[in-house]
Interface confidence: medium
Amino acid sequence: DASGDLLNTEAHSAPAQRWSMQVPAEVNAEAGDAAVLPCTFTHPHRHYDGPLTAIWRSGEPYAGPQVFRCTAAPGSELCQTALSLHGRFRLLGNPRRNDLSLRVERLALADSGRYFCRVEFTGDAHDRYESRHGVRLRVTAAAPRIVNISVLPGPAHAFRALCTAEGEPPPALAWSGPAPGNSSAALQGQGHGYQVTAELPALTRDGRYTCTAANSLGRAEASVYLFRFHGAP
């Protein structure tokens, strides 16, 4: 396998470009956001237009698990995705332009770590190269943010309230309202990645209902008001 050293595998009258890969040492992003992992390369095969495969792996070079792989047919600029872990990885660069940059969507803290890009030429010029040092992705935690709060019609002419918040670690949600004693009950939310949703199933009284989201980095709150029209007695 390619060792990561610079190899000149062809002899030309003019000096050929050697294999090399350029990646930044580190990319920083916040949980829930997207990040770009840049990677470009040079190679000694002038005007190579044969089949190629672009690969990204995590953890360690040459042996770590693949998180993304795509293949371009001979003479084609289109790199068809064969693997995108959890559907969150997308090729941003153009391998035919010697660019393997990768976009990672919906980042989680667990995505932190090293990523390694690799290109394989599988045509006449049978060759491959992989970044040895990789790019370190640092995913930082995110304080809670309430992204949606709403009142919806419920069964039997009642109303229900929904609150969706995001953060990393996922925040705990609690509703409080104008019920007697103004007690606050934490509800089990439905989680999707870094987003959490909690429902207050029955709004029995008019007034202000507040959703509070909290994690180790902070808290956020938002309110909705329920005022039903009461006809004349």
Epitope: G75, E77, R96
Partner: antibody
Framework: QVQLVESGGGLVQPGGSLRLSCAAS????????MHWVRQAPGKGLEWVSY????????YYADSVKGRFTISRDNSKNTLYLQMNSLRAEDTAVYYC?????????WGQGTLVTVSS | DIELTQPPSVSVAPGQTARISCSGD??????VHWYQQKPGQAPVLVIY???NRPSGIPERFSGSNSGNTATLTISGTQAEDEADYYC???????????FGGGTKLTVLG
């Protein structure tokens, strides 16, 4: 929001030099490839040059090869085009553009006039 | 180098469908992008990678790429769509980007 602002255009004599700049903001400049595209008065668009995110890979149109040099300073979020040995046919509005899925964001352009 | 050929002009009545073609060798193996340019303004990307619409671009804009021809389709054309339109692709052999000559879209009436 993404913003690209070109500067450095002006009137220059044939054989002269000019350096264009493109100040980028609103995105992680150091993660994106960038391009220069030009448009002669009343004519269509012509691609001029490309630079990869780190500056390690550069490509040029045949019409400017050997005369123009593209570069970038990621610490300043700025793209450059050094233009030497200018000719009358280089007269155009020069745009910088971000490269992703085509050229997804463009500056407003800076006019370069080469005339004696 | 690849050459992209567009009709110099296309006319369409308001509310009708406008189609702008872009022909060139081996286009199905290349991504084609489309730009709209109004007088005195910078170009705006309206379709990328053959048939994808950037956010903010109305749904009436669509693209296709088959055979040796890529097509930009504007359904229910509006007066504000009157502009110059350019197709563009990347030539992997010369490592250069190529634009079509441009098409002036006129919305009649």
């Amino acid at each position: 929001q993404v913003q690209l602002v070109e500067s450095g255009g002006g009137l220059v004599q044939p054989g002269g030099s000019l350096r264009l700049s493109c100040a980028a903001s609103g995105f992680t400049f150091s993660s994106y490839a960038m391009h220069w595209v030009r448009q002669a008065p009343g004519k269509g668009l012509e691609w001029v040059s490309y630079i990869s995110y780190s500056g390690s890979n550069t490509y040029y149109a045949d019409s400017v090869k050997g005369r123009f040099t593209i570069s970038r300073d990621n610490s300043k979020n700025t793209l450059y085009l050094q233009m030497n040995s200018l000719r009358a046919e280089d007269t155009a509005v020069y745009y910088c553009a971000r490269g992703w899925g085509g050229f997804d964001y463009w500056g407003q352009g800076t006019l370069v006039t080469v005339s004696s | 180098d690849i050459e992209l050929t567009q009709p110099p002009s296309v006319s369409v009545a308001p509310g009708q469908t406008a189609r702008i073609s872009c022909s060139g060798d081996n286009l199905p193996n290349r991504y084609v992008h489309w730009y709209q340019q109004k007088p005195g303004q910078a170009p705006v990307l309206v379709i990328y990678d053959d048939n994808n619409r950037p956010s903010g671009i109305p749904e009436r804009f669509s693209g296709s790429n088959s055979g040796n021809t890529a097509t930009l389709t504007i359904s229910g054309t509006q007066a504000e769509d009157e502009a110059d339109y350019y197709c563009q692709t990347y030539d992997m052999f010369s490592m250069s980007d190529v634009f079509g000559g441009g098409t002036k879209l006129t919305v009649l009436g």
